[in-house]
Every structure is written in C-alpha cells, then in structure tokens.
C-alpha cells in the first residue's frame, strides 16, 4: 500500500481579524494508526494549535468528525482570528509509539495571513497655545493594522498638507503594525474655526479611510488689538472713554483701567461678541468727571489675555479744554457697570 501523505491544499489563507480561519488537511491513508495534530511554526519551538485527543483548544473546531470510521479529513477552523494568529500552520500525522507518539509525516504548511483594521487615528496638538505666524506640530497615531502597507495624509480645512514625516513600526516582520506621523502647521489669525485632519487608508477599509481631527481652536491664541477712544461729552463735565478689545481668542481676558498709573477698576470679559472668524470683540468704558481734575489725566487700558503678559493702550485726557468748578467734589451719575467717576 502507498505510504500515507498529508496534504494541505492551500499554500496560504487570508482572513480578516475577528473572522474564522479554515485550515484544510487530508491524509491519503488510515495507516499508520495515530492522531493528527496541528502546529504553528516548525522545529522545537512550534506551538500546538490542536490535538484531537487531549488538551484544551476552545477556539478550534474540526470540519468533519475525526472519530468517524475511515475519516481522512483533518481540517480545522480557528475562531476569532487576531493578528497574533498569523504564521504557518502544519498538519502533522503521528504514529502511536512508546513511551510517546512519534511524528510520522507533516503537511507542507499553510500560511495564515491576517488582515486587521487600523485603530481610529488619534490626533494630538501642542501642549501650549501658539499665536499666528508660528509653526506648530500635530501628531497622528494609529495601531494594530496588518498588512504593513498603509497610506496617511494630512489636511487643513480640506487642503492637503505636505510638511509631515511618517513612520510605520516595527520595520521588520510583525503580527501587526503602528503608524506615527508628525505634521507642521503654520497658524493664521483666521484659524479659530480651522481643523487639522489625519486620514488613514488601508486595504481593510475598502476605500473608506479613517479620520482623526484636531480643532485649531484648542491650539491657537489670537492676541487682541486695543483701541482707546474718547467719546463726545455726554453731559457737562463728563467724558466717556472706551477701550475696544478686538479679535482675540480664546475668551479668557481680564481688563484693568489705570488712572495716572493707579488701578481704577479690574473686570473680566463676559458679554463678548463673536466675529465670523471665531475671534471675539469686547468693549469697556469709563465715565470721567473732568471737573474733579486740575491736571491732565492719563487713562490706560491694560489687558491680560489667556494668562499672557499684559498689553496696554493709553489715552491722555485734556482737562484744560473744559471749564472747571474749583473745589467741586460732586460725583457724576454712575449709569453703568463699566463706568468710573473721577473726582
């Protein structure tokens, strides 16, 4: 009788992570008597995948009933495949022996390749905010994919970026891979509403790439511009001075009025108006009773924005241009929370 052959008809099998792999194996004879075992890898370090008679293999099922008389189909199914299952699987026939069974013949092997989807890309920006005209770095990471081939692109508001560096690790063979990319982005004053997008394309995604986003509102700081103006006289001896704080982001802002260098009032921006570009405007004003002053008054609007060093703008209020009531200490009417009377 012809000597037994172990036939593994599939040189390779490709399975998506989470699915079931079928590894086919048939024997050409019932002799010699002995079990079939499946291994991953060859040599002394090989891993036992299935032993038909003993051991615990909860992920493995047989395609046919191995105990049926004259059964020569030793194919198996492995459930819930992960990238760690990739490798070459051998169907091996043993001959019963003493003390141990003896390996009789092995199949040629079936290479199991696992396709695994990349994880959702995670985009992270700089730890500290930066101002327009500065260049900031964004990183994008995705893990657990196989095979190694992958494409990563960066976009800012739909426009593809070119200044980035990408690494796929590890360099050599592995059950799964990770990608890490760093992109450089130049900020502009209009970037409060901007988004940076990292897009990952992989064979497992069937042309529907994964995207990770970062909002530049988390990254940008647009410093305010200040303008201090003197309004026309509201009533006799009263002058309205306003400080226009324009085009700032984020909203966190504290304003202090100084009269001749002395703190007059401090307030926090609350009722702000939002511009189309996402920046904010705010206005603070003082009502000054000029009759209380013999000399000119230097009014300073000092703004501390988002914890940065204060910026300021000053305005000289000429009191000589207005009639004075000597010795008057009458206060002007306080008509608003942003008003300040000077005696």
């Amino acid at each position: 009788e012809e000597e037994l052959q172990v036939i593994q008809p599939d040189k390779s099998v490709l399975v998506a992570a989470g699915e079931t792999a079928t590894l086919r194996c048939t024997a050409t004879s019932l002799i010699p008597v002995g079990p079939i075992q499946w291994f991953r890898g060859a040599g002394p370090g090989r891993e036992l995948i299935y032993n038909q008679k003993e051991g615990h293999f909860p992920r493995v099922t047989t395609v046919s009933d191995l105990t049926k008389r004259n059964n020569m189909d030793f194919s198996i199914r492995i459930g819930n495949i992960t990238p760690a299952d990739a490798g070459t699987y051998y169907c091996v026939k043993f001959r019963k022996g003493s003390p141990d069974d003896v390996e009789f013949k092995s199949g040629a092997g079936t290479e199991l390749s696992v396709r695994a989807k990349p994880s959702a890309p995670v985009v992270s920006g700089p730890a500290a905010r930066a101002t327009p005209q500065h260049t900031v770095s964004f990183t994008c990471e995705s893990h657990g994919f196989s095979p190694r081939d992958i494409t990563l692109k960066w976009f800012k508001n739909g426009n593809e970026l070119s200044d980035f560096q990408t690494n796929v690790d590890p360099v050599g063979e592995s059950v799964s891979y990770s990608i890490h990319s760093t992109a450089k982005v130049v900020l502009t004053r209009e970037d409060v509403h901007s988004q940076v997008i990292c897009e990952v394309a992989h064979v497992t995604l069937q042309g529907d790439p994964l995207r990770g986003t970062a909002n530049l509102s988390e990254t940008i700081r647009v410093p305010p511009t200040l303008e201090v103006t003197q309004q026309p006289v509201r009533a006799e001896n009263q002058v309205n001075v306003t400080c226009q704080v324009r085009k700032f982001y984020p909203q966190r802002l504290q304003l202090t009025w100084l009269e001749n260098g002395n703190v007059s009032r401090t307030e926090t921006a609350s009722t702000v108006t939002e511009n189309k570009d996402g920046t904010y405007n705010w206005m603070s004003w003082l009502l000054v009773n000029v009759s209380a002053h013999r000399d000119d008054v230097k009014l300073t609007c000092q703004v501390e924005h988002d914890g940065q060093p204060a910026v300021s703008k000053s305005h000289d209020l000429k009191v000589s241009a207005h009639p004075k009531e000597q010795g008057s200490n009458t206060a002007a009417e306080n008509t608003g929370s942003n008003e300040r009377n000077i005696y």
């Epitope: 891993e47 036992l48 008679k53 615990h56 105990t67 141990d100």
Partner: antibody, heavy 113, light 108 residues
C-alpha cells in the same frame, strides 16, 4: 454539557482490588483520551495513566505500572480504572478527567485492614 | 520523567496583594503543554490556565501566566478572597505526565 460522574466511595482491605467507573455525558468517549489521577489525603496530584477509548491503547506512569488497568466501554460511554494489590498508601481520592480539561468529582478509596 | 518543582510550597498573603507562583521543570517543556489547575478543599481540580498563558473560560483577568523552557509563573495581580486555594502546574509534553507538588495560597 460535559459531565463526568464517578462511582461511589470504596473501602478495601490490603491486597484487594478496586475498580472505579467514570460515566461521561455530553461527548463521545471515543473522541478523547481519558486520564486517571490520584490524590492522597493532604497530598498533591499524581498522574496514573490514560486510555484512548477508540482503540484501547493505554499509557501508565512507572509508579503504577503492573498494578493498574485502565479500560473503556464505548457502548456505555464509561471509563474504568482498576488498581490491584492495594496497600494503605493507596488510600486516596481518584479522579478521571477528559483530555486534561474536564474532571470527575472524585472517588475516595480507603485501604484499611 | 519531567519533574515539576513549585515554589513556594505555601504563600501567605493578604487580599489586594500580588501573588507570584513559580513552577520549574527538570527539562524543557513546550509552552503549549504547560497547564495550571486550581483546587479548593473537597473539590476536584479546575483547569485555570492552559498553554502557559491562556486563561480558561470564566477565569478573571487578574490572573496571568507566563514563561518558557523550564521556568513558568502564575501571577495574580490583586488577590481576592476567593483566590485562596492550592495551585498545581502540570506538563503533558511527554510521558509520564506530571504535576508539581502544589503551592498553597493562604490568607495572611
């Protein structure tokens, strides 16, 4: 559901023979090796041997070789372990197990004169 | 035959502590053939870890197994009251199959 139900406790005199049964359900006994394990009071586990019920092939630990016989009846889905020439140190709980994964509840054998 | 030596014989710890149980083989055992069992008084052993590092069904993730060649370890990251029992390592790489003598994990 896989179940292995062993026969009840036995008290035997030195020199006698004991035969313990292990009736299985939830699987075909021919599909798996059936193992037997000894555990003396307060001691650890000791492998006695196993049978392949499909062809009655057996393997025994050297310590028990010559005194132990493991058999199986595929028609009743039952495995047996027979230990002869009993001595006091054979007093133990004897377990059957299916392919190293599922165990019977144990059978206490007491050897006493 | 392959002799499995477990250490320590007894391990006294408190709930919440980390437990490390060792199993040393007299000759090399393929990781596929190294199993761990848990046994409580009056009960049959239960398969706990198979193929060195795989948890049997229903075993909590605080348990882990590792090792290769001749040195194997069962680790419990944070002991729960129900973990106190005897643990046996077992090899079925070659006949005769053998068990370690067991490590008794007791409450301190």
């Amino acid at each position: 559901e896989v179940q292995l139900v062993q026969s009840g406790a036995e008290v035997k005199k030195p020199g006698a023979t004991v035969k313990i049964s292990c009736k299985v359900s939830g699987f075909n006994i021919k599909d798996y090796y059936m193992h037997w394990v000894q555990q003396a009071p307060g001691k650890g586990l000791e492998w006695i041997g196993r049978i392949d019920p499909e062809d009655a092939e057996t393997k025994y630990a050297p310590k028990f070789q010559g005194r132990v016989t493991i058999t199986a009846d595929t028609s009743t889905n039952t495995a047996y372990m027979e230990l002869s020439s009993l001595r006091s140190e054979d007093t133990a709980v004897y377990y059957c197990d299916r392919g190293l994964a599922y165990w019977g509840q144990g059978t206490l054998v007491t050897v006493s004169s | 035959e392959i002799v499995l030596t477990q250490s320590p014989a007894t391990l006294s710890l408190s709930p919440g502590e980390r437990a490390t149980l060792s199993c040393s083989a007299s000759s090399s055992v393929s990781s596929s053939y190294l199993y761990w069992y848990q046994q409580k008084p009056g009960q049959a052993p239960k398969l706990w870890i198979y193929s060195t590092s795989n948890l049997a069904s229903g075993i909590p993730a605080r348990f882990s197994g590792s090792g290769s060649g001749t040195d194997f370890t069962l680790t419990i990251s944070s002991l729960e009251p129900e973990d106190f029992a005897v643990y046996y390592c077992h090899q079925w790489s070659s006949y005769p199959y053998t068990f370690g003598q067991g490590t008794k994990l007791e409450i301190k």
